[in-house]
């Protein structure tokens, strides 16, 4: 007996061939001997089976001695033995229909679990193997679970169902809802405008929810909510914003916040949370602000940074086109009695400059000018 595997919702073609390459009489029946379809001359006749409105054949193939039974929109319960009667012969085909579904939404938050459930006909004992978009293989029986979904799990999961040495492949598109970056850091000179961007790692037709940015300033003892907002069909509207700082927010995605001025008292870290409609849990993105200030007071030239810096970052003070006068893994450096000229304060990571502030030191009888 020939075995054919089908996928729920798909179309399957069961073949039946006669030795004579011409249109002769044929009938397809199910295991209960109920007629599904057949022919009378060049016309198609249908029986009283449950498949009536989903069964088809192709008359153009009859003249070639091929009498297919085409079943559209397959259901698990279509799994059966189908018998083709042609030329006093009986051809039996066993059809097994499988379905594979994500038993939750296919749009899942980062860190959530994905469960795939296999629907199979009674009496079958299939095995399933799924491959994630990042190449991770998982195996199982009727259910497969993946905990702690990551951003790289977004995309097409390819699952192979094996039964009777035959296989059928399912493709399931999974969208992991997350921000593109888990964390970002912005380096700014004092007084500069600060732009925070929170791009999403997914696109959906309609996006509705609400969000908030909590900020922990380095100088503050506790965190405070800087802004709350709503998201409706990808349109952003601010609900509440603090007076200091007075953040501005873009009306369209990606989520975009503007801080008018980078000041030492704002340096620190923030956590933007986004709660999406009909989803349990929230999306998070951490954002950090490092602020630099270079000042000259009397005979002391000082460079300071505020905010979450890594201990391996180097802070230097140097006169333009000269070697660094001072270079330390500290958050403040200074030079006493600096020479006149354009001084540079540099925050760097392994030689790569992250932030630079210039200050002009005038001869001692003048006051300093900050460009």
């Amino acid at each position: 007996k020939k075995v054919v595997l089908g996928k729920k919702g798909d179309t399957v073609e069961l073949t039946c061939t006669a030795s004579q390459k011409k249109s002769i009489q044929f009938h397809w029946k199910n295991s209960n001997q109920i007629k599904i379809l057949g022919n009378q001359g060049s016309f198609l006749t249908k029986g009283p089976s449950k498949l009536n409105d989903r069964a088809d054949s192709r008359r153009s193939l009859w003249d070639q001695g091929n009498f297919p039974l085409i079943i559209k929109n397959l259901k698990i319960e279509d799994s059966d033995t189908y018998i083709c009667e042609v030329e006093d012969q009986k051809e039996e085909v066993q059809l097994l229909v499988f379905g594979l579904t994500a038993n939750s939404d296919t749009h899942l938050l980062q860190g959530q679990s994905l469960t795939l459930t296999l629907e199979s006909p009674p009496g079958s004992s299939p095995s399933v193997q799924c491959r994630s978009p990042r190449g991770k293989n998982i195996q199982g029986g009727k259910t497969l679970s993946v905990s702690q979904l990551e951003l790289q799990d977004s995309g097409t999961w390819t699952c192979t169902v094996l039964q009777n040495q035959k296989k059928v492949e399912f493709k399931i598109d999974i969208v992991v809802l997350a921000f593109q970056k888990a964390s970002s850091i912005v380096y700014k000179k004092e007084g500069e405008q600060v732009e925070f961007s929170f791009p999403l790692a997914f696109t959906v037709e309609k996006l509705t929810g609400s969000g908030e940015l909590w900020w922990q300033a380095e100088r503050a003892s506790s965190s405070k909510s800087w802004i709350t907002f709503d998201l409706k069909n990808k349109e952003v509207s601010v609900k509440r914003v603090t007076q200091d700082p007075k953040l501005q927010m873009g009306k369209k995605l990606p989520l975009h916040l503007t801080l008018p001025q980078a000041l030492p008292q704002y340096a620190g870290s923030g956590n933007l949370t986004l709660a999406l409609e009909a989803k349990t849990g929230k999306l998070h993105q951490e954002v950090n602000l490092v602020v630099m200030r270079a000042t000259q007071l009397q005979k002391n030239l000082t460079c300071e940074v505020w905010g979450p810096t890594s201990p391996k970052l180097m802070l230097s003070l140097k006169l333009e086109n000269k070697e660094a006068k001072v270079s330390k893994r500290e958050k403040a450096v200074w030079v006493l009695n600096p020479e006149a000229g354009m001084w540079q304060c540099l925050l760097s990571d392994s030689g790569q400059v992250l932030l630079e502030s210039n200050i002009k030191v005038l001869p001692t009888w003048s006051t300093p000018v900050q460009p």
Epitope: K46, P48, R59
Partner: antibody
Framework: QVQLVQSGAEVKKPGASVKVSCKAS????????ISWVRQAPGQGLEWMGT????????MFAQKFQGRVTMTRDTSTSTVYMELSSLRSEDTAVYYC???????????????WGQGTLVTVSS | DIQMTQSPSSLSASVGDRVTITCRAS??????LNWYQQKPGKAPKLLIY???NLESGVPSRFSGSGSGTDFTLTISSLQPEDFATYYC?????????FGQGTKVEIK
């Protein structure tokens, strides 16, 4: 002379159902399959489904499955097509058409009803 | 389902012209193809069945040809009453499909 006479025009609200009838005369009613074909304003022909008046067996285009019902009343030689969950896109002229081949599903329609305009509007 | 594509979607011709309309199937349908004529406000009328057979009562100026995927409806000498929309229809599959139609207009 074979004739297919359809029920009159209907105006329906979105979400409602409509039932159109098609009465056959001048031929052996149960010998010929009846199909329903619709035509939206300014658009082409779209096959909806077919009923075998002899067995009552039906088949439908995938697009309409779950929303369309076709029945027959052999005592009055009438077939019915009911379309549920109506939306504005269902505004069309609905035709019944008889298969030219006796006892079979040949798909060549030699006799047609005059058409029934169904308007779906809120 | 089998897709049917007609060309052109419309054409302008004069009385006496020879007019050709083509229909292409997305897969081979042998000769399981019909042609219909429809005039505004009227039900369609069967002209040709099984690709080349003229329905009774249809004038002989109408002819059909083709097999497999490519089919043609020809009107040898266009008459005033032939200005209408023409549709092809496949019946190879029991899930019938029509072409989008070709409108024949007066030049």
């Amino acid at each position: 002379q074979v004739q297919l006479v359809q029920s009159g025009a209907e105006v329906k609200k979105p979400g409602a159902s409509v039932k159109v009838s098609c009465k056959a005369s001048g031929g052996t009613f149960s010998s010929y399959a009846i199909s329903w074909v619709r035509q939206a304003p300014g658009q082409g022909l779209e096959w909806m489904g077919t009923i075998d008046p002899n067995s009552g067996g039906t088949m439908f285009a995938q697009k309409f499955q779950g929303r369309v019902t076709m029945t027959r009343d052999t005592s009055t030689s009438t077939v019915y097509m009911e379309l549920s969950s109506l939306r504005s896109e269902d505004t069309a002229v609905y035709y019944c058409a008889r298969d030219s081949a006796e006892w079979e599903l040949g798909g060549s329609f030699d006799y047609w009803g005059q058409g029934t305009l169904v308007t779906v509007s809120s | 389902d089998i897709q049917m594509t007609q060309s052109p979607s419309s054409l302008s011709a004069s009385v006496g012209d020879r007019v050709t309309i083509t229909c292409r199937a997305s897969e081979s349908i042998s000769t399981y193809l019909n042609w219909y004529q429809q005039k505004p406000g009227k039900a369609p009328k069967l002209l040709i069945y099984k690709a080349s057979n003229l329905e009774s009562g249809v004038p002989s100026r109408f002819s059909g040809s083709g097999s497999g995927t490519d089919f043609t409806l020809t009107i040898s000498s266009l008459q005033p009453e032939d200005f209408a929309t023409y549709y092809c229809q496949q019946t190879d599959s029991t899930f019938i499909t029509f072409g989008q139609g070709t409108k024949v207009e007066i030049k």
